[in-house]
């Protein structure tokens, strides 16, 4: 679609006669008739296929046509058409005398011509207008004339239909050849594209609008390459989306398992140091003076029995004094002045002499223990039982109450994870220091081999037009989620062109 | 036990500003992404803001944008919401919730109320 | 914006029964929904995740199902503690947005 443009400039008539010689009277005034046609080789009469304009009456005799409109009339002179421009024309132009004010062809007497020229030739679609001047023996017209497109218009032949737009459906101006031309911010071949925000991650990101950084289900961050843990975690991180990696000092599932409760809590009293001894336990281990669970509780230093053979222990302000039967002496009345001969060895325990007889070492039967066989053993002294276990004498023997989550008989072994049967889909389960590990079978991953996994449909690229893959997992089926302007099980068919485009 | 409880609400003249806080307990704060979540009297919900965990990118309704300001304080366990130019249309219960905008909201406070009214 | 659409918007059933809540997406949210029920005067509670993942804690008589555009939330036995508001929340596309909710009272 353009449009045939038509400047008249001058017409001189000098001596106001007609084609026939004729003189008009008083004076020729004067209008024209333009008609536009397909290229002729000889311009004959016939129709005018692309279009003709008539004038009103612009001047008398010889005169200048004013640019724009001159009674009423536009100047330059518009011949419309609505197909390609073929590059070639005829144009045959008329001057005619208006004796009165019915300008219709059918109203004027057939020698009221002025003047007819035809000319013919090629004319290209552009802004430049091409200066013509055509002489007879009694007038002369000069004229310019060009061809241009119609708005929305481009190209050589002005076939190429380009509006431009900044909507749903595009975002863009049109140049001159009549390709579009992206406005900032926007791509693709209709500019629906738009450009997210520099480093924008190409998989886990998205923008609806230009420099925005959306993050897909499971990211986020400004660039979107950050991922979220799991729903339910507690105190963990992740390195992929959902997953839960338990901070130090936390395990299970969701890291909601205590396993440094001593950091976490500070259980221990009294300056005692606190041992992590498992899940949500531990053990405080007290300083002098002090005993419970906690250490919370302040006794007397003579309580733990400090006197050694059978010394007597005086509580002191700054600490206790033993008194050490004949034969001791020491701090904690340690050291021995008796010999083999004194028969220091009691309840059956054997004498033995060291260093030339200046000294001595018993040598204990079953069930006692002491530098002199004086003491009942407690099978509990040397804190047999392990992971926080609860060591309870039994008459000759001993027995371990163990914590939760261990078993054994020194509570030296976990109770297993596993037990639960927690691994889905038939993984295998094997038990960790601090948890569990599932090993998952083919088309199963996760934690707990709770997802199912499968070929992955997406990895052929089967989805056309900038599309996003998404792999189903139940059907091991491939989905695309097209862009604007795309349908079809792959996006393959464009959509929503205006329907007077021509391709 | 996750737990998270709000405080600074109160009735405010359209306008107005008022600053809403979140004190959160029971899980590693610095990890998980934040939101605000709102509920006019006798409506449904209504996302208000999210925060990143990772590097505070935050997040807006239209409606609220340029007159809401989210932001937290790790070290403090706390998310806060400031609000300002108050309209009688940001009258509601306001939730802090754990998630971003595009994860559910796994965890919830028990609601601070916002009367914005003259 | 995409719009979710809950049905019905309120109903009535005994204990024991079995009751089905929809929610319609207004495009493809892939299975990125969640249900949250909330009860008078409290904060709204996750149900469950990515369409048909039990939040911890969540009875199992809680269950969803759908994909695309059409999800289902059902209760499989209504104990007298489900009487609630129910909500279906969408977080594929941004911003998130909220069903109108479905109230579940008791006949």
């Known amino acids: 679609s353009g449009v045939f443009q038509l400047q008249l400039q001058e017409f001189i008539n000098e001596r106001g006669v007609l084609a026939s010689g004729r003189p008009c009277e008083p004076g020729c005034r004067t209008f024209f008739r333009v008609c536009l046609k397909h290229f002729q080789a000889v311009v004959s009469p016939g129709p005018c296929t692309f279009g003709t304009v008539s004038t009103p009456v612009l001047g008398t005799n010889s005169f200048a046509v004013r640019d724009d409109s001159s009674g009423g009339g536009r100047n330059p002179l518009q011949l419309p058409f609505n197909f390609t421009w073929p590059g070639t024309f005829s144009l045959i132009i008329e001057a005619w005398h208006a004796p009165g004010d019915d300008l219709r062809p059918e109203a004027l007497p057939p020698d009221a011509l002025i003047s007819k020229i035809a000319i013919q030739g090629s004319l290209a679609v552009g802004q430049n207008w091409l200066l013509d001047e055509q002489t007879s023996t009694l007038t002369r017209l000069r004229y310019s004339y060009r061809v241009i497109c119609s708005d929305n218009y481009y190209g050589d032949n002005c076939s190429r239909l380009c509006k431009k737009r900044n909507d749903h459906f595009g975002h863009y101006v049109c140049q001159p050849d009549g390709n579009l031309s992206c406005l900032p911010g926007w791509t693709g071949e209709y500019c629906q594209q738009p450009i997210c925000l520099s480093g924008c991650h190409e998989q886990n990101g998205y923008c609806s609008k230009p420099a925005e950084c959306l993050c897909r289900p499971g990211w986020q961050g400004r660039l979107c390459n950050e991922c979220i843990p799991h729903n339910g975690c507690r105190h963990g991180t992740c390195s992929t989306p959902w997953q839960c990696t338990c901070d130090e000092g936390w395990g299970g599932l969701f890291c909601d398992q205590d396993l440094n409760y001593c950091t976490h809590h500070s259980p221990c009293k009294n300056g005692a140091t606190c041992s992590n001894s498992g899940q949500r336990s531990y053990t405080c281990t007290c300083r002098p003076g002090y005993t419970g669970v906690d250490c919370e509780l302040e006794l007397s230093e003579c309580d733990s029995n400090p006197c050694r053979n059978g010394g007597s222990c005086k509580d002191q302000e700054d600490g206790y004094h033993c008194l050490c039967p004949p034969g001791y002496y020491g701090l904690h009345c340690e050291h021995s002045t008796l010999s083999c001969a004194d028969s220091p060895c009691f309840n059956g325990g054997s004498c033995r002499e060291r260093n030339q007889g200046a000294n001595y070492a018993c040598e204990c039967p079953p069930n006692f223990t002491g530098s002199n066989c004086e003491k009942k053993v407690d099978r509990c002294t040397s804190n047999p039982c392990a992971n926080g276990g609860q060591c309870l004498n039994r008459g000759p023997s001993r027995m371990c109450r163990c914590r939760p989550g261990f078993t054994g008989t020194y509570c030296e072994l976990h109770v297993s994870d596993c037990a639960r049967n927690p691994c889905a889909h038939g993984g295998t389960c094997h038990d960790l220091e601090n948890g569990l590990m599932c090993t998952c079978p083919a088309g199963f991953s996760g934690r707990r081999c709770e997802v199912r996994t499968s070929i992955d449909a997406c990895a052929s690229s089967p989805c056309f037009n900038r599309a996003t893959c998404y792999t189903d997992l139940s059907t091991d089926t491939f989905v695309c989620n097209c862009p604007y302007g795309f349908v079809g099980s792959r996006c393959e068919f464009p959509v929503g062109l205006p329907p007077s485009f021509p391709w | 036990e996750v737990q998270l409880v709000e405080s600074g609400g109160g009735l405010v003249q359209p306008g107005g500003s008022l600053r809403l806080s979140c004190a959160a307990s029971?899980?590693?704060?610095?990890?998980?992404?934040m939101a605000w979540v709102r509920q006019a009297p006798g409506k449904g919900l209504e996302w208000v803001a999210t925060i990143s965990s990772s590097d505070g990118t935050t997040y807006y309704r239209d409606s609220v944008k340029g007159r809401f300001t989210i932001s937290r304080d790790n070290a403090k366990n706390s998310l806060y919401l400031q609000m300002n130019s108050l309209r009688a249309e940001d009258t509601a219960v306001y939730y802090c919730?754990?998630?971003?905008?595009?994860?559910?909201?796994?965890?919830w406070g028990q609601g601070t109320l916002v009367t914005v009214s003259s | 914006d995409i719009q979710m659409t809950q049905s019905p918007s309120s109903l009535s059933a005994s204990v024991g029964d079995r009751v089905t809540i929809t929610c319609r997406a207004s495009?493809?949210?892939?299975?990125?929904l969640a249900w949250y029920q909330q009860k008078p005067g409290k904060a709204p509670k996750l149900l469950i995740y990515?369409?048909?993942n039990l939040a911890d804690g969540v009875p199992s008589r809680f269950s969803g199902s759908g994909s695309g555009t059409d999800f289902t939330l059902t209760i499989s036995s209504l104990q007298p503690e489900d009487f609630a508001t129910y909500y279906c929340q969408q977080y594929n596309n941004y911003p998130p947005t909220f069903g109108q909710g479905t109230k579940l009272e008791i006949k």
């Open positions: 495009e493809d949210i892939y299975s990125n």
């Open positions: 919730s754990r998630g971003y905008y595009n994860s559910p909201f796994a965890y």
């Open positions: 990515d369409t048909n």
């Open positions: 029971g899980f590693t704060f610095s990890n998980f992404p």
